[in-house]
């Protein structure tokens, strides 16, 4: 009866995603393997969060937009772990929009999703930021590593949208 | 006082080429962003190629992608258009502009008085 | 490309009327409160002279009788009392994303 009634509380939830995703990929995960925590498919998952690479060229204000229609926001980067898996799935020859900007050019960097800006955890490639006119962040490889460079807003990037694990 | 003065337009044959230049003062030229802006008769206003401050970037449209080529000497506060590859849709007046980065975006503050560029035969 | 629609093409007007002159764009050149839409003046044999930045911010130099509003797709230029020296074409500009582009522009000429 309880399997049951929790059966059908997920088919309800299910149906409620399945308006804004038309396929979730979900694992189940938790103590007992009780709880199923979902990604919009085909993105990929980490930790408590799902990943998308957008591989269409836009500037860092339509990049944002796209990924808030999804749902998620251009990715905020917590840890060096975090970014590790990113990676994983990105082209060395290209750049990615990260959720960093400077919009007035003051070097005040901020997170599209409001998280304190941590000077101690950044990841900017050397000598970077160095433009108060570059007032947006990318992620892209150079010298041998990944990292981050500061770039021109209105300048089409790829770019990578990040949003919290769906649990049902 | 900031200045913008271009030069080195004129008449030219179809597949022909011509250097513009801006002579830029009053101003830390090195500074700023800088822009070609061309205006051809009776039409709009059309972006034709930027440069950044610090020479690392470098766009263009699609339409004079591959033909011209925007370059900077800070030392000599110039700004510079190479148009090769001319086409008779090419005519109009060339304006260099300063650009002042607002936001996320950029407007242009100050402007030059023009060049004419004529390409036909 | 983001496309700016002007209008009207023409404003007939007399000296000492409001000029309410019309920007739409093909899509949305907001973000949050920045508000990326720029307005220029431009008079026969000139080059352009920017107006209005960020939607509502005065250029420094300009009377303050030119006034900018809007966001999203619709932004207007309003000059409260026209004077002599306003009889001219006017143009939009946004600069979101390249290719920054322009408005056809309004021309404001003497009834």
């Known amino acids: 009866n309880f399997m049951y009634s929790k059966t059908v509380k997920r088919l309800s939830k299910l149906q409620e995603y399945q308006q804004y995703y038309p396929s979730l990929t979900c694992v189940m995960e938790g103590k007992d393997m009780e709880d199923w925590s979902c990604c919009p498919t085909p993105w990929t998952s980490f930790q408590s969060s799902c990943y998308f690479i957008s591989t269409v060229m836009q500037s860092w204000t339509k990049s944002q937009n796209n990924c808030s229609v999804m749902g998620a926001d251009l990715v905020v980067i917590n840890t060096k772990e975090e970014q590790d898996f990113i990676t994983q799935n990105l082209k060395i020859n290209s750049a990615y929009f990260l959720g960093l900007s400077d919009p007035k050019g003051w070097r005040h960097w901020q997170w599209v999703d409001q998280t304190p800006y941590n000077k101690n955890v950044t990841f900017w490639h050397s000598g970077e930021p160095n433009s108060p006119d570059e007032r947006c962040a990318i992620i892209n490889f150079r010298s041998e590593e990944w990292g981050w460079n500061d770039v021109h807003c209105h300048v089409p990037q790829k770019s990578i949208c990040k949003m919290k694990k769906i649990y049902i | 006082e900031v200045q913008l003065v271009e030069s080195g337009g004129g008449l030219v044959k179809p597949g022909g080429s011509l250097r513009l230049s801006c002579a830029a003062s009053g101003f830390t030229f090195r500074s700023y962003g800088m822009s070609w802006v061309r205006q051809a008769p009776g039409k709009r206003l059309e972006w034709v190629s930027t440069i950044s401050s610090g020479d690392s970037y470098t766009y263009y449209p699609d339409s004079v992608k591959g033909r011209f080529t925007i370059s900077r000497d800070n030392a000599k506060n110039s700004l510079y258009l190479q148009m090769n590859s001319l086409r008779a849709e090419d005519t109009a007046v060339y304006y260099c502009?300063?650009?002042?980065?607002?936001?996320?975006?950029?407007?242009?503050?100050?402007w030059g008085q023009g060049t004419t560029v004529t390409v036909s035969s | 490309e983001i496309v700016l629609t002007q209008s009207p093409a023409t404003l007939s007007l007399s000296p000492g009327e409001r000029a309410t002159l019309s920007c739409r764009a093909s899509?949305?050149?907001?973000?949050?409160?920045?508000?990326?839409m720029h307005w220029y003046q431009q008079k026969p044999g000139q080059a352009p002279r920017l107006l209005i930045y960020?939607?509502?911010n005065l250029e420094s130099g300009i009377p303050a009788r030119f006034s900018g509003s809007g966001s999203e797709t619709d932004f207007t230029l309003t000059i409260s009392r026209l004077e002599p020296e306003d009889f001219a074409v006017y143009f939009c500009?946004?600069?979101?994303?390249?290719?920054?582009?322009f408005g056809g522009g309004t021309k404001v000429e003497i009834k």
């Open positions: 500009q946004q600069s979101i994303e390249d290719p920054p582009t």
């Open positions: 960020g939607a509502s």
């Open positions: 899509e949305s050149v907001s973000f949050r409160t920045s508000h990326l």
């Open positions: 502009a300063r650009q002042i980065y607002y936001d996320y975006a950029y407007y242009f503050d100050f």
